[in-house]
Interface confidence: low
């Protein structure tokens, strides 16, 4: 059966569409294309004679159409008025005519949208903001993006006005964006320039970095204070309660043991009127903290397979360290039966299986040092099972 197919079905204004023909009969005299769902001479676009390979334009020809020997019709520079049905009539050599109708839809290229806002400088936990995507157009889908991701599900986010308007209830500092709106139709999509919110907040409790407590005499002490705040916080430093300077960073060259003490960072936001402080202890000493060798203990070292469980414990007196476990040079846990708990200090295996037999050890580490325990050997026994019917398992 004769059929036509539009390539593409949805066409962008100004582009081209090809009306493809399938199952074209072999013995033909010619064929004609018509605008509409039926053969109408007043609406003929073009006729094509096979013998002369001659194309003849019809009354509905706009000069943008091209017919091919395989009967396909190309329409270039389409407009929205071209939307609709097209009918092909094939004149076969047995003079029995066949017809097939197809259609396509022309959509406009969408303009670049823009975002309008009712409040660009909201206060955290207090203000609401409504964004509106402009312009309003027909047959258009409106989408919103926050941080280049689609809208998360949140009771603080509300869509209205056919998704053209996005409302943020009770903004937080994390709502700065950027926000973009996108308009779509079947042939085009366009995204707005990003819009950001200047959310006033803070300061939060300051953080003093680096986190080191111990320093060696003769070193340079360089402390930096940071508190999340908008506008940025103003900082000041106190040492043992005595004001030093109003800077974000504190630098003391060539420190001595006399520089040990309490270092206080004070952060102030002049807009919110809020203040926060953090105190850090600095110890200047010749001693260099080294991670000590941890101890490893087992609740039992010989267990029955598929029946018993075992707990391995890694003990250390050091603070500020992390723990990891190893078995046959593989890091653990390596199976569902292995669980770590109490800050990785305890490794539980439940139940123990034959493949769990072997050497275990733990390692404690911090950013500058690490140490391993002595290995511990876990033995796994299996109770002899009676054979059924005197047959050996095979």
């Amino acid at each position: 059966q004769l059929t036509t197919e539009s390539m593409p079905f949805n066409v962008a204004e100004g582009k081209e569409v090809l009306l493809l023909v399938h199952n074209l009969p072999q013995q033909l005299f010619g064929y004609s294309w018509y605008k509409g769902e039926r053969v109408d001479g007043n609406r003929q676009i073009v006729g094509y004679a096979i013998g002369t390979q001659q194309a003849t334009p019809g009354p509905a020809n706009s000069g943008r159409e091209t017919i091919y020997p395989n009967a396909s019709l190309l329409i270039q520079n389409v407009t929205q008025n071209d939307t609709g049905f097209y009918t092909l009539q094939v004149i076969k050599s047995d003079l029995v005519n066949e017809e097939a109708t197809g259609q396509f839809h022309v959509y406009p290229e969408l303009p670049k949208p823009s975002i309008s806002s009712n409040n660009s400088n909201p206060v955290e936990d207090k203000d609401a903001v409504a964004f509106t995507c402009e312009p309003e157009t027909q047959d258009t889908t409106y989408l919103w993006w926050i941080n280049n991701q689609s809208l998360p599900v949140s009771p603080r986010l509300q869509l209205s006005n056919g998704n053209r308007t996005l409302t943020l209830l009770s903004v937080t500092r994390n709502d700065t964006g950027p926000y973009e709106c996108e308009i779509q139709n079947p042939v085009s999509a366009n995204r707005s320039d990003p819009v950001t919110l200047n959310v006033t907040y803070g300061p939060d409790t300051p953080t003093i970095s680096p986190s080191d407590t111990y320093y060696r005499p003769g070193a340079n002490l360089s402390l930096s204070c940071y508190a999340a705040s908008n506008p940025p916080a103003q900082y000041s430093w106190l040492i043992n309660g005595t004001f030093q300077q109003s800077t974000q960073e504190l630098f003391i060259p060539n420190i001595t043991v006399n520089n040990s003490g309490s270092y206080t960072c004070h952060a102030n936001n002049s807009v919110t009127g809020c203040n926060r402080t953090t105190v850090k202890t600095i110890i200047v000493t010749e001693l260099s903290p080294v991670v000590a060798k941890p101890q490893i203990k087992a609740s039992k070292t010989t267990v029955t397979g598929d029946k018993d469980s075992v707990n391995l414990t890694c003990s250390t007196n050091d603070t500020g360290i992390s723990i990891r476990w190893f078995f046959k040079n593989q890091s653990l846990p390596s199976s569902e039966r292995m669980k770590l708990s109490q800050g990785n200090t305890t490794l539980s295996i439940n139940p123990v299986k034959r493949e769990d037999a072997g050497t275990y050890w733990c390692e404690v580490f911090n950013p500058i040092s690490k140490n391993q325990s002595d290995p511990i050997m876990l033995n796994v026994n299996y109770n002899a099972l009676p054979q059924e019917n005197g047959l050996s398992p095979g």
């Epitope: 950013p367 500058i368 040092s369 690490k370 140490n371």
Partner: antibody
Framework: EVQLLESGGGLVQPGGSLRLSCAAS????????MSWVRQAPGKGLEWVSV????????YYADSVKGRLTISRDNSKNTLYLQMNSLRAEDTAVYYC??????????????WGQGTLVTVSS | QSVLTQPPSASGTPGQRVTISCSGS????????VSWYQQLPGTAPKLLIY???RRPSGVPDRFSGSKSGTSASLAISGLRSEDEADYYC???????????FGGGTKLTVLG
């Protein structure tokens, strides 16, 4: 594609100075610690200096302390090595190298092609 | 004299497995991660192994690293002629506050 391109090498007399540059591209330069490593002709690798991603921490090999100075300009994606009071034993190919671990597990995953510094009278 | 000690040379025939050792102390290998680098003649070094035993993407699994105490080793299985190169181990040294390399091992693929 990550690229490190050293320049500034050449022939210099003992006691003289040179400034090496390493232009970085293909990655966020300001997120990586950077090192200089050198290799004397026919010899092995010798680490020279490291600078943290923000420039706040700097270390030098004992053999170059006080004579060589490492620095960086993150706005230009460039690493530098200022070489003063040069000696014959500073003759080497100088490589710049990137440390992807920010110094927590120092290693050098990308190296430049090297620039030759010859100290001779 | 390098802080990390490597054999100056090693050799093997194609298809063989060879191992290169690297010996240090508690201030470097014992308490820090080891890396291995390959330097083909006339080229810059290339990272083969980092963090004792991890391979960067693109490095064949014929190369493997291990560490025990204050020693590390690089194993190359299924040796190929293109593996002929200098191999260096390296680690951060807590005492020197600097990165240290081994003296390098020249690997020759025979035959």
């Amino acid at each position: 594609e990550v690229q490190l391109l050293e320049s500034g090498g050449g022939l210099v007399q003992p006691g003289g100075s040179l400034r090496l540059s390493c232009a970085a591209s293909g990655f966020n330069f300001s997120n990586y610690a950077m090192s200089w490593v050198r290799q004397a002709p026919g010899k092995g690798l010798e680490w020279v200096s490291v600078i943290s991603h923000g420039g706040g921490s700097i270390y030098y090999a004992d053999s170059v302390k006080g004579r060589l100075t490492i620095s960086r300009d993150n706005s230009k994606n460039t690493l530098y090595l200022q070489m003063n009071s040069l000696r014959a034993e500073d003759t080497a190919v100088y490589y710049c190298a990137r440390d992807p671990t920010k110094g927590y597990a120092p290693t050098f995953d990308y190296w430049g092609q090297g620039t030759l510094v010859t100290v001779s009278s | 004299q390098s802080v990390l000690t490597q054999p100056p040379s090693a050799s093997g025939t194609p298809g063989q497995r060879v191992t290169i050792s690297c010996s240090g102390s508690s201030s470097n290998i014992g308490n820090n991660y080891v890396s291995w680098y390959q330097q083909l003649p006339g080229t810059a070094p290339k990272l083969l192994i980092y963090a004792d035993s991890r391979r960067p993407s693109g490095v064949p699994d014929r190369f493997s690293g291990s560490k025990s105490g204050t020693s590390a080793s690089l194993a190359i299985s299924g040796l190929r002629s293109e593996d002929e190169a200098d191999y260096y181990c390296g680690a951060w040294d807590l005492s020197l506050n600097g990165y240290v390399f081994g003296g390098g091992t020249k690997l020759t693929v025979l035959g």
